[in-house]
Amino acid sequence: RKIPKVGHTFFQKPESCPPVPGGSMKLDIGIINENQRVSMSANIESRSTSPWNYTVTWDPNRYPSEVVQAQCRNLGCINAQGKEDISMNSVPIQQETLVVRRKHQGCSVSFQLEKVLVTVGCTCVTPVIHHVQ
Amino acid sequence: RKIPKVGHTFFQKPESCPPVPGGSMKLDIGIINENQRVSMSANIESRSTSPWNYTVTWDPNRYPSEVVQAQCRNLGCINAQGKEDISMNSVPIQQETLVVRRKHQGCSVSFQLEKVLVTVGCTCVTPVIHHVQ
């Protein structure tokens, strides 16, 4: 799903207030709901009819440093007999997410939001048949 | 997929530098890769064998203000005949993502990261039968 553009409104102070100095704002340390957890379990990536693998990308100047990307294993979907059914398609499910990029020059550290496109998993779909005359 | 805990390292300055004042840091305005977009196939939520609906939640003090959650339509999966196959299960694919929470008291505006659990879509799985006595 798509994250809309920021425009210039969300991070600005109300019009009646003095502007933010130097194009930056105050970000409080700590994360709300940090202990919230994903309840996905039991290797669904292997047991799905559109199975996928995971690749981990690591960047120490990004939070989270670890970003996991899924890649669909097959073009088709896996049927009840464990065979690939090429009349159906395994397609990626993608999500735009925010990460925080750390930038430092000596003791001057600043942060910036970054939009990252993550493939979260795959699903099995009926292809759209476009008959061309 | 899971976002690891921040600990207290990512947002801190190097040890040799003076500490961040008042438990906050500088966040630059603007978003890196803001124009990046999801390239998911058309209407996969309806064409999937584990179809889903979308619900939009809106919060003007969150960025992005719009967060879209998927809900699987069925318990079973949809077979080639368009019937629900209850020997297979439609399960949610979930992803932890970051949003920015805006907090203001008068002209004092600060921001904080918040972890949100998003159901991105659904996939069809064979349940593992592990009956525990």
Partner: antibody, heavy 123, light 106 residues
Framework: EVQLQQSGPELVKPGASVKISCKTS????????MHWVKQSHGKRLEWIGG????????SYNQNFKGKATLTVDKSSSTASMELRSLTSEDSAVFYC????????????????WGQGTSVTVSS | QIVLTQSPAIMSASPGEKVTMSCSAS?????MHWFQQKSGTSPKRWIY???KLASGVPARFSGSGSGTSYSLTITDMEAEDAATYYC?????????FGAGTKLELI
């Protein structure tokens, strides 16, 4: 210990609606499906439908589509079923029953049952 | 939908007797499940995945079968076994139950 505590007996007039509830304890409500089953006068059991609080998924028996609506309230770990346009044919005992989690056990794999709620439709 | 036909509808047995009841499916199913219900109480899971005994079920019970033909057997009938037994399938939508076999104690 898994427990499913259903609401009390109901006497309702024909054409009216009724909502019966099933309060759960002893397990993580969000992770398991809840099914509803009808039993008329001690006879055959009929599956009405099921709902999974985590996935949002629902499944209905065609015979009960338009008759029954299943909902969940995650905050109170309670499942509910509303029955509408009631007739004498709807007089029965209705059970909630826990199904699987979809990951380790099939959503339709019923293990625990509530004590039943008797619904009598009479003018 | 898959129709499950249980036979006999009613049967009687003496303590110590071997009891077998059957469940026939109108189409092939991978597994059959059984529930026990005593008068005035809710059903209890009894046998699942054709042959696995639910927690607390005595070892004198067993289940077997495949395809369209399944059965539940009690090797030595005891008084507490008197109840109605329902077979159930969730191989095909909708989930269905048999009409039940009522087992009475002589």
């Amino acid at each position: 210990e898994v427990q499913l505590q259903q609401s009390g007996p109901e006497l309702v007039k024909p054409g009216a609606s009724v909502k019966i509830s099933c309060k759960t304890s002893g397990y993580t409500f969000n992770e398991y499906t809840m099914h509803w089953v009808k039993q008329s006068h001690g006879k055959r059991l009929e599956w009405i439908g099921g709902i999974n609080p985590n996935s949002g998924g629902v499944s209905y028996n065609q015979n009960f589509k338009g008759k029954a609506t299943l909902t969940v309230d995650k905050s109170s770990s309670t499942a509910s079923m509303e029955l509408r346009s009631l007739t004498s044919e709807d007089s029965a005992v209705f059970y909630c029953a826990r199904g699987g989690d979809g990951y380790y056990t099939n959503y339709f794999d019923i293990d625990y049952w509530g004590q039943g709620t008797s619904v009598t439709v009479s003018s | 939908q898959i129709v499950l036909t249980q036979s006999p509808a009613i049967m009687s047995a003496s303590p110590g007797e071997k009891v077998t009841m059957s469940c026939s499916a109108s189409s092939s199913v991978n597994y059959m499940h059984w529930f026990q219900q005593k008068s005035g109480t809710s059903p209890k899971r009894w046998i699942y995945d054709t042959s696995k005994l639910a927690s607390g079920v005595p070892a004198r019970f067993s289940g077997s079968g495949s395809g369209t033909s399944y059965s539940l057997t009690i090797t030595d009938m005891e008084a507490e076994d008197a109840a109605t037994y329902y077979c159930q399938q969730w191989n095909s939508h909708p989930l269905t139950f048999g009409a039940g076999t009522k087992l009475e104690l002589i």
